[in-house]
């Protein structure tokens, strides 16, 4: 498909006239950020945003590629360098714990510096690091987590938690050595760590206790509460703030948002992860673009600012499934929220960052024709006379061998939500990559993201930005909080 | 392998510092740019960017991705979206009328709008489209194209030649009609389209008439000229200009560069492509970097300044063949010539952009060990309970199966040269890929390079930054060529 | 509480046609895959067909055997799920249950079923 | 398409046995199977989904294992309330269910 109106070069050099005038245009801000705003698309390598691009797109009739997601409407780039102190493809942990926290750490490990070991429970003293959150919080801003995952994952815990294993979700997680020695579990943390205004996401399991039904699945047993210390979480964190309130539900959601009494809100939508937006029940559980607004609305109260987390965490669930479909449809709606935040904020006042934590082995090629769908296949057949699809992952749970041979795929087959798509290795779960990532920034202090730089940068653009611990002497006018 | 200062946080702190002192110091210069350089990594994404980083840094007996590669220290980048006119994932012919013309093209035609169709030469007139080259050439500076494929390859063809057919090499390689209806091939348009002072590659053998023997292999029947219409290009070449040298190996390269008298130098080093990188014989042909060298010796001499082309051509050629080694030293070899000319030149007058034509469905993954070779095992077992390498590609020739099974390998294997790493999909030639690639830059007007941009961007910015065509009302001081 | 309600069963002669109902309430109708699952006399569970939700457009799936005779659609207005039999065969004869998924842990399980309708093809 | 393989086709047992029933498919459904006990004359009901989770009110007695291609259901202690017949379902790719296990009581 070739349009009509690009086979005349005036359309590309008129677009990239326009494109240098907007360049040229761009004026670095001199002023500090009164709010901080990070966007994580978890496992959003560079290969999962053309893609979600072109898929979204195509959703609005579009040939795809031309189109702009909100995050490339952000007018600075960088690059991250993601591998951890002990690894050179990382995890979910570590690396929280550097676009958080400023600091990084060892695979699997959240909140602490490499000097803690994963599992090691006696490494955690005197080795925790602290997030731009909570030094946000500490500056008298109001802070807010949002996720598509339970709220004690992995790269949201980067933002309270300090644990030696990623996977101590709640204290059955925890061996029995472990609490003995003091350590506590992320959801434990999650309530004690420090005071967190709002809390969204999954992970309702982790704070009731074994045999604690769950409410929207009260007939599934292994839905329900996992506390084997008896503790009731939600009941604790309820009690510390009169202006608490905590939700399951969208309707609920939708309400505490607009109550003026909700000083502290916490909603917790699934037992574990929240369900893909695809499987997601729109009377049950929010998008990730209403809690994204739901916690806007929140935290633009305090006329201090705030700091917030959205996570766009089950992008990287997709791609581990090796479900292409799944990954892409998360990050389209991850981008659908960074777009929400940016019509509900100023970027006279809001520093805006989005990215990813580090990729994913997956792969676009084959050479389609513009407006091929991206799940559809490559023209033309492989050497074993088969069809393949653009879309495919270097290792994964999509490899599969039929009578000692690849198998053939169909573009109906390669088109549905539940496909594979195949690869090189037979994995479980398709495995993390090590690129460079991108960082995307709008707002004061924008213009800092630059280049190539190490993953810890970003959480020192973040307190730079708004003049935090360590950078209080940051010398912005207005000076961040002068606005109270 | 845990560095110890990396476990102390002030590790990271410092050097996040140091990073944001060095933002907060980078200054847009307002100055015209007098001299602009390209570096063009063919097929070289981020995911080869950070493999290379990683190789290049174990070479030098560091663990790899906490070095720098010299295109890291550019200070600005931004994402190219590579896509062409007709293709999702697009080709090197394609690409290069967008970064070399800044006007996206149809797969395989070069030098032309998309209004020109693949292999219809009666497509091509009024369809051509200007490169910065040329019009850097017209407004008197000096000119060069450097690059270890054939000269007459798709990207170098970019800069100077107008074909609906980037594989029409010599006339040998265009069809009878075609050539009847007024179609040059590629070799011819090097030498006429306009004058370039410095050529520098590979492809002989598409300059002098078929039984020409080559003079690096003059018993190899195959490497001998292939023209059909009996001219000797180099010779009618050398007859254009007084100052005019041509050079078939590096001895003659290396004086030749030299050489006050020479105002012009063709040096074509092997028949077709140059040899990889870990092939070459160091006595005959020279590197990249050498190649890079000579030219900037011979265009800095031009007081109105220079444009200079240098690609590291078979970056992708590894790719394609699956060999991840000779990709990643192709790339290190590329970057070796960056950092060259980073010493030869000043960024206070040359804009210096350095870019991928497009991507390679190539990964690297599997959570390996820091400090681990980038050709190594994956840690653990596959679910066929085989080993299996961080490396992968998702399609290509590297797929086999032996006994109905996927190939066990060993680090031994791996590591070799030869070494064919497995892909999901069997193809005789491994795919581009379609997501972005990163731009950095460095010099006047540098700061431009910002966002998501399309890749016909890079050519404007070119334009602009040293005041040529459209952008001669650049506004910049001082103004381009002041210098004469 | 999740329930499903099918109709449309009854006796049939073959190559004729017969189109089967299923009414669901409480719960979103539009957020949740549903299929038909048949089970012959004395046999074995079967499932014949798939409609996904709104977020994937209403996708439909088949199994082999009835691919081309029969249609799975669905009326979100009315909360509905149908399956349209045409050529029918005596070893179409079963019971027709309507199913809906549930979403755990990714999967697509099928875990609410109607009571079911019974269909007899014969002459 | 995956096609599961379900074993015995039948089997008797006396109150209080350990009774193990096992699905294979024909490629790895990434612990994605479930099992359903059916009774005369009424719809399946759903006892385990994604191998081993339980749903509420199905009695611990019931439990299922594995991965890949092989997955095993298990009742640790029969009663005379389970007799039924018993499928598995995969669901990673579409659906397929096991040919059905009845289970008597000897």
């Known amino acids: 498909i070739i349009p009509v109106e690009e086979e005349n070069p005036d359309f590309w050099n008129r677009q990239a006239a326009e494109a240098l005038g907007a360049a040229k245009k761009l004026q670095p801000a001199q002023t500090a950020a009164k709010n901080l705003i990070i966007f994580l698309g978890d496992g959003m390598g560079v290969s999962t945003v053309t893609a979600a691009r072109i898929l979204k797109g195509q959703k609005k009739d579009k040939l795809g590629p031309e189109t702009f997601l909100a995050m490339d409407r952000f007018p600075y780039v960088a690059l991250s360098k993601t591998y951890s102190v002990d690894k050179h493809v990382p995890d979910s942990g570590a690396t929280a714990t550097a676009y958080l926290c400023g600091v990084k750490g060892n695979f699997q490990t959240i909140g602490l510096s490499a000097a803690a070991r994963f599992n090691q429970c006696n490494t955690t003293r005197g080795n925790e690091v602290i997030s731009v959150m909570n030094r946000a919080k500490k500056a008298g801003k109001s802070v807010g987590v949002v996720t598509t995952t339970r709220v004690q994952h992995a790269s949201p815990a980067g933002a309270y938690a300090h644990t030696v294993n990623r996977n101590w979700y709640s204290d059955a997680d925890v061996p029995a050595s472990a609490r003995q020695e003091g350590c506590q579990d992320i959801a434990t943390q999650l309530i004690s760590n420090m005071d967190i205004d709002v809390i969204l996401g999954g992970g309702r399991k982790y704070m009731f206790p074994m045999g604690t039904p769950d409410p929207e699945y009260p007939d599934d047993y292994s839905q329900g509460g996992t506390r084997l210390d008896g503790k009731n979480l939600v009941q604790e964190w309820l009690a510390k703030h009169q202006g608490a309130r905590y939700v399951w539900n969208r309707t609920e959601l939708l309400q505490a948002s607009l109550d003026p009494s909700v000083t502290h809100l916490m909603g917790l939508f699934e037992p574990g992860d929240m369900k893909y937006e695809i499987h997601r029940d729109s009377t049950l559980d929010p998008s990730l673009m209403e809690m994204t607004e739901a916690a806007l609305l929140l935290l633009s109260r305090n006329p201090r600012g705030f700091f917030l987390f959205v996570e766009g965490g089950r992008i990287d669930h997709g791609h581990h499934e090796s479900r292409a479909y799944r990954a892409l449809t998360e990050t389209i709606m991850f981008d659908d929220a960074i777009e929400r935040a940016g019509q509900l904020t100023s970027e006279e006042d809001t520093l805006s960052l989005v990215t990813a934590d580090h990729s994913h082995v997956f792969s676009f090629g084959g050479y389609p024709l513009r407006g091929s769908s991206i799940f559809g296949l490559a023209p033309g057949k492989a050497r074993d006379r088969k069809a393949y699809t653009v879309l495919l992952y270097g290792n994964g749970p999509g490899y599969v061998l039929k009578d000692g041979a690849r198998p053939d795929v169909t573009e109906s087959e390669s088109g549905s939500p539940e496909y594979r798509q195949q690869s090189a290795v037979p994995l479980d779960g398709e495995t993390h990559a090590g690129e460079d990532v991108a960082v995307f920034a709008r707002g004061p202090q924008a213009h800092l993201v630059h280049g190539v730089q190490e993953q810890t940068f970003i959480a020192h653009v973040m307190a730079f930005a708004a003049c935090l611990e360590p950078y209080t002497a940051c010398d912005l006018a207005p000076r961040a909080g002068t606005t109270d | 392998i845990i560095p110890v200062e990396e476990e102390n946080p002030d590790f990271w702190n410092r050097q996040a510092a140091e990073a944001l002192g060095a933002a907060k110091k980078l200054q847009p210069a307002q100055t015209a740019a007098k001299n602009l350089i390209i570096f063009l990594g063919d097929g070289m994404g981020v995911s080869t960017v950070t493999a290379a980083r990683i190789l290049k840094g174990q070479k030098k007996d560091k663990l790899g991705p906490e070095t720098f590669l010299a295109m890291d220290r550019f200070p600005y980048v931004a994402l190219s979206k590579t896509y062409s006119v007709d293709k999702h994932v697009p080709d090197s012919g394609a690409t290069a009328t967008a970064y070399l013309c800044g006007v996206k093209g149809n797969f395989q035609t070069i030098g032309l709008s998309a209004a020109a169709r693949f292999n219809q030469c009666n497509t091509t007139r009024g369809n051509e489209v200007i490169s910065v080259m040329n019009r850097a050439k017209k407004a008197g500076k000096s000119v060069g194209v450097v690059t270890t494929t054939r000269v007459q390859h798709a990207s170098p063809a970019g800069a100077y030649a107008h074909t609906v057919n980037r594989n029409w090499y010599s006339d040998a390689d265009v069809p009878a009609s075609a050539r009847q209806e007024g179609c040059q091939d590629i070799a011819t348009q090097l030498i006429s389209n306009m004058d370039i002072d410095v050529i520098l590659g590979g492809g002989r053998k598409y300059m002098f008439p078929m039984g020409t023997p080559d003079p690096e292999y003059p018993d190899d029947y195959s490497q001998g000229g292939t023209r059909l219409d009996g001219k000797n290009l180099v010779q009618e070449w050398l007859a254009k200009h007084q100052g005019a040298r041509y050079v078939w190996n590096r001895t003659e390269l290396l004086q030749a560069s030299l050489d006050p008298s020479v105002t012009h130098l063709m040096g074509l080093f092997e028949p077709g492509d140059m040899k990889y990188e870990i092939h070459r014989d160091s006595t005959l042909d020279p590197s990249l970097m050498e190649m890079t060298e000579a030219a900037l010796l011979l265009l800095s001499r031009n007081p109105r300044g220079f444009f200079l082309f240098v690609e590291g051509g078979r970056i992708d050629h590894g790719h394609h063949e699956s060999r991840a080694y000779r990709a990643l030293t192709e790339t290190i070899m590329f970057d070796d010539a960056i950092e060259r000319a980073g010493q030869l030149t000043s960024e206070e007058d040359t804009l210096s952009l350095v870019t991928a034509d497009h991507s390679h469905v190539f990964s690297f993954g599997g959570y390996p060990l820091r400090g681990s070779s980038i050709f190594g095992l994956a840690p653990g077992k596959a679910r066929d309970r085989k080993a299996y390498t961080v490396l992968l590609y998702g399609n290509g020739p590297g797929y086999v199966l032996k006994d109905g099974a996927r190939p066990d390998v060993t680090e031994s294997e791996s590591g070799s040269p030869e070494y064919r790493q497995q892909s999901a999909v069997p193809l005789d030639g491994e795919t581009h890929a379609g997501e972005d690639v990163a731009v950095f830059a460095r010099g006047p007007q540098a700061h431009l390079v910002h966002g998501v941009q399309e890749q016909t961007f890079i050519a404007h910015v070119m334009a602009f930054a040293a005041c040529l065509e459209p952008y001669t009302a650049c506004d910049l001081a001082p103004r381009a060529g002041t210098t004469d | 509480e999740v329930q499903l309600v099918e109709s449309g069963g009854g006796l049939v002669q073959p190559g004729r046609s017969l189109r089967l109902s299923c009414t669901a309430s409480?719960?979103?109708?539009?957020?949740?895959?549903m299929s038909w699952v048949r089970q012959a006399p004395g046999k074995g569970l079967e499932w014949l067909a798939l409609?996904?939700?709104?977020?994937?457009?209403?996708?439909?799936e088949y199994t082999a055997s009835v691919k081309g005779r029969f249609t799975i659609s669905r009326d979100n207005s009315k909360n509905s799920l149908y399956l349209q039999m045409n050529s029918l065969k005596t070893e179409d004869t079963a019971v027709y249950y309507c199913a809906r998924a549930s979403f755990y842990y990714d999967g697509k399980v099928l875990a609410y079923w109607g009571q079911g309708t019974l269909v007899t093809v014969s002459s | 398409d995956t096609q599961m393989t379900q074993s015995p086709s039948s089997l008797s047992a006396s109150v209080g046995d350990r009774v193990t029933i096992t699905c294979q498919a024909s490629q790895d459904i990434n612990k994605y199977i479930a099992w359903y006990q059916q009774k005369p004359g009424k719809a399946p009901k759903l006892l385990i989904h994604y191998t081993s989770s339980l749903q509420s009110g199905v009695p611990s007695r019931f439990s299922g294992s594995g991965s890949g291609r092989d997955y095993t259901f298990t009742i640790s202690s029969l009663q005379p309330e389970d007799i039924a017949t018993y499928y598995c379902?995969?669901?990673?790719?579409?659906?397929?269910f096991g040919q059905g296990t009845k289970l008597e009581i000897k």
């Open positions: 409609i996904r939700n709104k977020a994937t457009g209403y996708t439909t």
């Open positions: 409480g719960f979103t109708f539009t957020d949740y895959y």
């Open positions: 379902l995969q669901y990673d790719n579409l659906y397929t």
